[in-house]
């Protein structure tokens, strides 16, 4: 060292800005200066390292007025590469001077070209777009050639401007862009061996997603309680924030503030700042603001704090003291206007006992009682009990709930018949509607007349949108009304109104309606009043069982309000299956006031016409085909035979006599009478009985004597029998004359 002029900065034994040495060598570095000084070493060199020795500054140089110190590093390693600085200790005289000297020492090692190797896990490097980014792959020798790559296969080439290489610092990217986000690696090949150190760039963002304060505003406290406000800032993963509070006691530092980061979320960071004031006073009331800042981004959140000297309760009706709702509502809220602090205990009573114990449908929500699925059972008196035990404060208030019910007609709910009933012509009928509702419904009876046109078949003759007329007992609309009456009755524990309409004489078809209404709504029940002159609305008749050669006459009568599409069919069984055969040459059905008639006549039947004949009609309401069957057995023809032959007979003059000629045969034989071979005709004094089977002679005379013959005839043949009638006694004819 020379002993020249005063040293403004310490002087190092190694000249220049850098020095290259080989790993394993010893580094000697002396520092001489005008004042006491200290050493600053690279972070990779530990002051506790046994290989490092630093002599304390001791007198040296010009008359021992200078200070010298020696740094010795035995067996230097690659990671000892870095900036070594000798610095004057701070004194009042040296403050203004640049009081240090530095040299960058490269400890070159072919086996460790990079000072820091990040192979197992890449080193995280934070970046902000538009700012300088350094990929700190510092090397142990300034001669090492380093390449910067981005996974998977991009190379970031230094251009001397945007990307530059500095062996002391690494790659310097002047203004980072999204292109530098990713897994970057520095590669160096030394003596044919590839070395890689990895870095993961992490974009620093300023995105504040949300700021909240818990508990929510307003926060109410009693004097002496503890205020705790938790401000939560949610940000993107790569965002850092500064959090601060503005509050009434900030100047006197009334609050203690703690901060923490929650990193458990996979896509966000959550920052917490917790403000706490013990023993709040009225001076602590006011606005508390949590301020969150990240770069140029800023968000804040306010909450107001109220401090009360003592507790209080005030309760009023939110609506009227008497409230109304409707049965069947999904829910009803009984609500009171309550101002209280601290939060009181709440109990709701229904008719004097705890509501929530009465039914699981009662839910307490704040100062409201929510009644789910309202029923008539929910009508009653509801009392809210409010209590703050520690303040010995208690209040209550009662509201009455009326549950209205839309009218219901009981008969509508019971399963109705698929098709309407029929009312026999001329009959007396009692029609009933049992009604329930709150308030009690008003019941009226109405009459809907039907189109009454029997000139043709009508299936839509009676529709419900016809004009309707309100009925009273004196109405002469439709059928004669005997009475309309109402009575109250208890059914299944509830008061119901039974309204009865008595029809005196069922003559006119139509629709009777009972209509029940109250302020909640209206309900109507339609009673189709179909009058029938046919028993059960469907009747089949056979004039008589025909014999071969006779005519088959069948008649089908159906109620025209209930049936349509009337037809005769013949049922035949083939292979255990019943087949329906339509019958041709059917007559047209005739429509009367109440019914439709379809006659079937089959002339000159044969045995083959025997079978099951059915009248089929379609029920207008159900669409179902209804069959009414009748068995027809065509009787085989049989020649006549007499059950008893005539026998000779004597009769007194002026007496009377009966000759009997009972014959059987199929078809029933025709009986003809002869006297002395002359056909007998009915005339005064001679009477032919039923089917000509008897011959009755009144006041017998001599002329009546003779041979009487009866002849029974049908298609199969004839049979006859004769007898002689003798008249006894003389004639007094001459006397009479």
């Amino acid at each position: 060292y020379g002993s020249g002029s005063k040293l403004k900065v310490p002087e190092l034994s190694l000249k220049g800005t850098q020095h290259v040495m080989q790993a394993g060598q010893t580094l000697f570095l002396k520092c001489r200066g005008e004042a006491a000084h200290s050493w600053s070493l690279p972070t990779t060199v530990s002051q506790e390292d046994k290989r490092l020795s630093i002599t304390p500054p001791s007198a040296c140089g010009r008359d021992n007025r200078q200070f010298c110190s020696t740094l010795t590093l035995d067996t230097a390693q690659a990671n000892h590469t870095g900036l070594y600085t000798c610095r004057y200790l701070p004194t009042s005289t040296s403050k203004k001077k640049k009081a240090e000297s530095s040299i960058y020492i490269f400890v070159s090692d072919a086996g460790s070209p990079f000072i820091e190797m990040h192979t197992d896990i890449p080193k995280l490097v934070h970046m902000t777009e538009g700012r300088q980014l350094i990929i700190p792959c510092r090397v142990t020798s300034p001669n090492v050639t380093v390449t910067l790559k981005k996974f998977p296969f991009d190379t970031l080439t230094p251009d001397g401007q945007r990307i530059t290489w500095d062996s002391r610092r690494g790659f310097i990217i002047a203004n980072a862009t999204y292109k530098e986000i990713g897994l970057l690696n520095c590669e160096a090949t030394v003596n044919g061996h590839l070395y890689q150190t990895n870095y993961l760039t992490h974009r620093q963002t300023n995105t504040i997603l949300d700021v909240q304060i818990r508990p929510p505003s307003p926060v109410r406290l009693l004097h002496g309680q503890t205020l705790v406000l938790n401000c939560t800032a949610t940000t993107e993963l790569n965002t850092r924030v500064q959090m601060s509070w503005n509050y009434p006691g900030k100047a006197t530092k009334r609050a203690s503030i703690r901060q923490r980061i929650d990193r458990s979320h996979s896509h966000n960071n959550v920052f917490h700042s917790v403000l706490k004031i013990n023993n709040v006073e009225s001076r602590d009331k006011g606005l508390y603001t949590c301020r969150v800042k990240s770069g140029s981004s800023f968000q804040s959140f306010n909450t107001s704090v109220h401090v009360y000297e003592k507790g209080f309760i005030s309760v009023k009706h939110r609506k009227q003291p008497v409230q109304e709702t409707t049965a069947g509502r999904r829910s009803y809220r009984l609500s009171m206007k309550v101002k209280a602090f601290p939060s009181p205990e709440i109990v709701w009573l229904k008719d004097g006992s705890p509501a929530t114990l009465k039914s699981a449908r009662y839910l307490v929500h704040g100062y409201s009682l929510i009644i789910k699925d309202v029923t008539t059972e929910d009508a009653g008196d509801y009392t809210i009990l409010l209590g703050i035990k520690q303040s010995r404060l208690f209040k209550n208030l009662t509201a009455t709930l009326i549950v209205n019910v839309k009218p219901q007609i009981y008969e509508k709910s019971v399963s109705s018949l698929p098709s309407p009933p029929l009312y026999p012509l001329g009959s007396r009928q009692v029609l009933t509607c049992t009604v329930y509702g709150i308030p009690r419904p008003t019941i009226t009876w109405l009459w809907h007349p039907c189109h009454h046109n029997h000139s043709k078949e009508r299936y839509d003759f009676c529709t419900e949108n016809e004009e309707s007329f309100i009925l009273d007992p004196s109405s002469n609309l439709g059928n004669r009304i005997e009475s309309i009456s109402q009575r109250m009755t208890v059914i299944e524990g509830t008061n119901k109104t039974v309204s009865t309409l008595v029809v005196a004489d069922s003559q006119t078809p139509g629709i009777y309606s009972c209509r029940a209404f109250n302020k909640i709504g209206t309900v109507e029940r339609n009673i189709k009043f179909y009058v029938t002159d046919v028993p059960n609305g469907f009747h089949v008749s056979l004039e008589k069982m025909p014999a071969e050669g006779e005519d088959l006459k069948l008649s089908c009568v159906v109620n025209k309000f209930l049936y349509r599409d009337i037809t005769w069919i013949l049922l035949r069984t083939v292979n255990n299956r019943t087949m329906h055969h339509s019958i041709s040459k059917q007559k047209m059905a005739t429509t009367q006031d109440y019914s439709i008639t379809l006659n079937l006549v089959i002339k000159n039947v044969s045995l083959e016409d025997s079978g099951t004949y059915a009248c089929r009609a379609r029920n207008i309401y159900t669409g179902e085909d209804i069959l009414r069957k009748t068995e027809v057995l065509v009787r085989d023809s049989e020649a006549p035979h007499l059950l008893q032959n005539l026998s000779d007979y004597e009769v007194s003059i002026s007496g009377s006599t009966t000759l009997d000629c009972q014959a059987r045969g199929v078809p029933a034989p025709q009986i003809t009478w002869f006297k002395n071979n002359h056909k007998i005709q009915q005339e005064p004094g001679i009477i032919l009985g039923p089917g000509n089977s008897t011959l009755f002679i009144e006041r017998v005379t001599e002329e009546d004597e003779g041979v009487y013959r009866c002849r029974a005839t049908n298609q199969k043949g004839a049979v006859e029998s004769a007898a002689y009638l003798t008249v006894q006694g003389t004639s007094d004819k001459s006397n009479l004359e």
Epitope: D120, F153, Y178, K179, I181, G182
Partner: antibody, heavy 119, light 111 residues
Framework: EVQLLESGGGLVQPGGSLRLSCEAS????????MNWVRQAPGKGLEWVAT????????SHAPAVKGRFTISRDNSKNTAYVQMNSLRAEDSAVYYC????????????WGRGTTVTVSS | QSVLTQPPSASGTPGQRVTISCSGS????????VYWYQQLPGTAPKLLIY???QRPSGVPDRFSGSKSGTSASLAISGLQSEDEADYYC???????????FGGGTKLTVLG
């Protein structure tokens, strides 16, 4: 929510072509490399192609080189693979994958789209 | 034939520890990071391990990865029935200039 959704699969005859698309949402698509990986029925995963974040560098598996082309449109947040001269052995479920966080492996996968090459 | 070699199957009973190996070469495993993927039946693969040994958030600490030279391994401790799946190792291959995968290991949880 971070998502990849593949589309364009279907039945094609040998020698035919298909273009598969992969639409990304919920992350900064233009920042990361994209990959296509396939899986034949009952088989393992097979890398098909990779494209860098800007779409300037691509790499294809030897089995598909010259027949398949990977591309991307950062304005549409979509990656594509154009498949020509298809063969029966190309039948597979095709997945697109990306990296969206700090892993730089395939940390986000689509549900896959099925390609069947058959006459 | 896969570039990385894995055993085709592995098994264990609930609570046991199982290890799945993956071997490669200097152009892939030795010079690059190893990733492990889990594929449950009928679903897309899911990243299980990255940078040889790191777990993404949401992956239980029962799963661990390691790498040594040209080999890597996945260890699952405290085996659970829901761990039954196919496991694949994957890495970048410098000579191929692309990703390579192992053939997959089917893990069966017995009993």
């Amino acid at each position: 929510e971070v998502q990849l959704l593949e589309s364009g699969g279907g039945l094609v005859q040998p020698g035919g072509s298909l273009r598969l698309s992969c639409e990304a949402s919920g992350f900064d698509f233009s920042t990361y490399a994209m990959n296509w990986v396939r899986q034949a029925p009952g088989k393992g995963l097979e890398w098909v192609a990779t494209i860098n974040s800007e779409g300037t560098i691509t790499s294809h598996a030897p089995a598909v080189k010259g027949r398949f082309t990977i591309s991307r449109d950062n304005s549409k947040n979509t990656a594509y693979v154009q498949m020509n001269s298809l063969r029966a052995e190309d039948s597979a479920v095709y997945y697109c994958s990306s990296t969206t966080g700090t892993t730089h492996g395939m940390d986000v996968w689509g549900r896959g789209t099925t390609v069947t090459v058959s006459s | 034939q896969s570039v990385l070699t894995q055993p085709p199957s592995a098994s264990g009973t609930p609570g046991q520890r199982v290890t799945i190996s993956c071997s490669g070469s200097s152009s892939n495993i030795q010079n690059n990071y190893v990733y492990w993927y889990q594929q449950l039946p009928g679903t897309a693969p899911k990243l299980l391990i990255y940078f040889n040994s790191q777990r993404p958030s949401g992956v239980p600490d029962r799963f661990s990865g390691s790498k040594s030279g040209t080999s890597a391994s996945l260890a699952i401790s405290g085996l659970q029935s829901e761990d039954e799946a196919d496991y694949y190792c994957g890495t970048w291959d410098d000579s191929l200039n692309g990703w390579v995968f192992g053939g997959g290991t089917k893990l069966t949880v017995l009993g």
